[in-house]
């Protein structure tokens, strides 16, 4: 998913040349101190370096960026803008880099960024127009087509006033921008659920990853409008059933993939119609390893392997035969 | 922009099999479908299958008959397509599609099939 | 296997011309009905797909309409390097399946 280089020969910059050069215009094609550049490959490396803020004498070749393993805190709006613009920036890196804050229009000036690696930052305070770029009801189209936002979410004692996933959703429909996004990674985030309103809003997704979370239900979600998915990735989450309706759902998307893996199903008699699904359909990938983890006496049976007589609820007593 | 680069063409015996590769380069947000079609002399398109290239799972135009075989290399970006059981009505341009709607299409591969 | 009936076959226009391509599936197809340009000797490039959305690059002369069984395809103004086959294709049901094409001219 992040950006790579084929890069042969990178050109590093001392950091006492670049100091030697700082009160003067920076050279067109310079390369950044505590960074590596290679033009043939239209890359920059800035990775490891403990850096606090953005280079502002980014070479205007550069197409990949990476700014990986550093300590910039907070991304201010039009981090990246410069005169003359990036024009060619199209994959951008900034994982593991310390950000807890991405104020609104951060990526502006950026006309041709088709790929944004966030992961692995703790973002307490994401702008909802850190993609869009304003506020207004409808923005320009972003012409990010992949984002990365995997492990995100900062410690809990770091967390806002609000809901986590709420931040994240408000980030991704903020004046529609984000249209013609085709991958979406959310892994790794603890949600608890999915607001029901992001996946219409986002009809160009072609791959979703919201593995590793905590989503126990997808009763209120609807991927109807995801019209052409074709990864859907809800491995390590705490799924318990599949109920008809998103079944139904996720059968008429005619080129999807369901990756549900590591969840703990719950094979009582609400499972009858899952197992029913996943004995027909061809759209879930390695479903003859998906195994129950309740109730005890079903644990590690194969969901595949069950029959409705292998699926009974306990009848629920009456209250006046109930016991305190 | 993705760019999908098929093998050359192929002159091929009755019987015989034939497999075209098909790379893909450029553009790194490709679909994870590869579909094959065959266009024969004057004529429509066909759809011969598909893989899901990151687990290898195949649709198949039944058609074909079980002659078609598609395989996907991901260290290489490269599927394949292979005929086998060819036959004189074989002779066709073969192409390679990505996406679920075939996005982007390579450029094609003459095969003939000829004694 | 679903049918799609496409017609006309072929059809002459003149530049500037409104030109309309009609797609018939055999069953519904749920709006998965994408349409293609073969130009002679050449590959194919999908134009218009989930019956309307324009892929990405392609002039918004090109639209298509449609629900159910029946679609269709407008060119609003037809410009010399529209000369091409056109070719309606099904993604709801497998096998995908495609119509027969129609071979645009400029008179």
């Known amino acids: 998913s992040s950006p790579t280089s084929s890069a042969s020969s990178f050109s590093s910059s001392a950091p006492f040349l670049a100091s030697a050069v700082s009160a003067q215009p920076p050279l067109p094609d310079q390369c950044p101190a505590l960074c590596e550049c290679s033009e043939a490959a239209r890359t920059v490396k800035c990775v490891n370096r403990n850096l606090t803020e953005v280079p502002t004498d980014l070479p205007a070749y550069v197409r990949n960026l990476f700014l990986t393993g550093n300590q910039l805190a907070v991304l201010p709006a039009g981090a990246f803008a410069r005169r003359p613009p990036l024009a060619e920036l199209a994959a951008l890196n900034l994982s593991g880099s310390r950000l807890d804050e991405v104020r609104a229009g951060a990526f502006e000036h950026l006309p041709s960024l088709r790929q944004l690696d966030l992961s692995h930052n703790p973002l307490a305070d994401l702008s909802p127009f850190a993609f869009s770029g304003s506020n207004a009801s409808v923005s320009a189209p972003s012409p990010l087509v992949e984002l990365i936002l995997n492990h995100i979410v900062p410690p809990e004692d770091e967390r806002q006033n609000r809901s986590f996933e709420g931040m994240v959703v408000a980030a991704l429909l903020a004046g529609r921008a984000l249209q013609g996004l085709r991958r979406l990674e959310l892994a790794s985030n603890h949600f608890l659920y999915l607001p029901r309103d992001v996946l219409a809003q986002l009809p160009s997704l072609r791959h979703l990853d919201l593995s590793n979370n905590s989503l126990v239900s997808l009763t209120y979600v609807s991927f109807r409008n995801l019209t052409h998915l074709e990864s859907l990735h809800l491995e390590d989450n705490a799924l318990k059933v599949l109920h008809n309706g998103t079944l139904a759902e996720l059968q008429g998307l005619p080129h999807i993939r369901v990756f549900l893996d590591n969840n703990p199903w719950v094979c009582d008699c609400h499972m009858a119609d899952m197992v029913t699904w996943l004995k027909e359909t061809e759209v879930v990938q390695g479903k003859d390893r998906l195994t129950c983890a309740y109730p005890e006496k079903m644990r590690n049976r194969v969901l595949l392997e069950l029959n409705s007589a292998d699926l009974d609820c306990d009848p629920i007593l009456p209250p006046s035969l109930q016991t305190s | 922009e993705v760019q999908l680069v098929q093998s050359g063409a192929e002159v091929k015996k009755p019987g015989a099999t034939v497999k075209i590769s098909c790379k893909v380069s450029?553009?790194?947000?490709?679909?994870?479908?590869m579909n094959w079609v065959q266009q024969a002399p004057g004529k429509g398109l066909e759809w011969m299958g598909r893989?899901?290239?990151?687990?290898?799972?195949?649709n198949y135009n039944g058609k074909f008959k079980g002659r078609v075989t598609i395989t996907a290399d991901t260290s290489t970006d490269t599927a394949y397509m292979e005929l086998s059981s060819l036959r004189s009505e074989d002779t066709a341009v073969y192409y390679c599609a990505t996406g679920g709607a075939m996005d982007y299409w390579g450029q094609g591969t003459l095969v003939t099939v000829s004694s | 296997d679903i049918q799609m009936t496409q017609s006309p076959s072929s059809l002459s226009a003149s530049v500037g011309d409104r030109v309309t391509i009609s797609c018939r599936a055999s069953q519904d197809i749920s709006n998965y009905l994408n349409w293609y340009q073969q130009k002679p000797g050449k590959t194919v490039k999908l134009l218009i797909y989930y019956t309307s959305r324009l892929h990405s690059g392609v002039p918004s002369r090109f639209s298509g309409s449609g629900s159910g069984t029946d679609y269709t395809f407008t060119i609003s103004s037809l410009q010399p390097e529209d000369i091409a086959t056109y070719f309606c294709?099904?993604?709801?049901?497998?096998?995908?399946?495609f119509g027969g094409g129609t071979k645009l001219e400029i008179k």
């Open positions: 294709q099904q993604d709801n049901t497998l096998p995908w399946t």
């Open positions: 450029g553009y790194a947000f490709s679909s994870s479908w």
């Open positions: 893989i899901y290239r990151e687990d290898g799972h195949t």
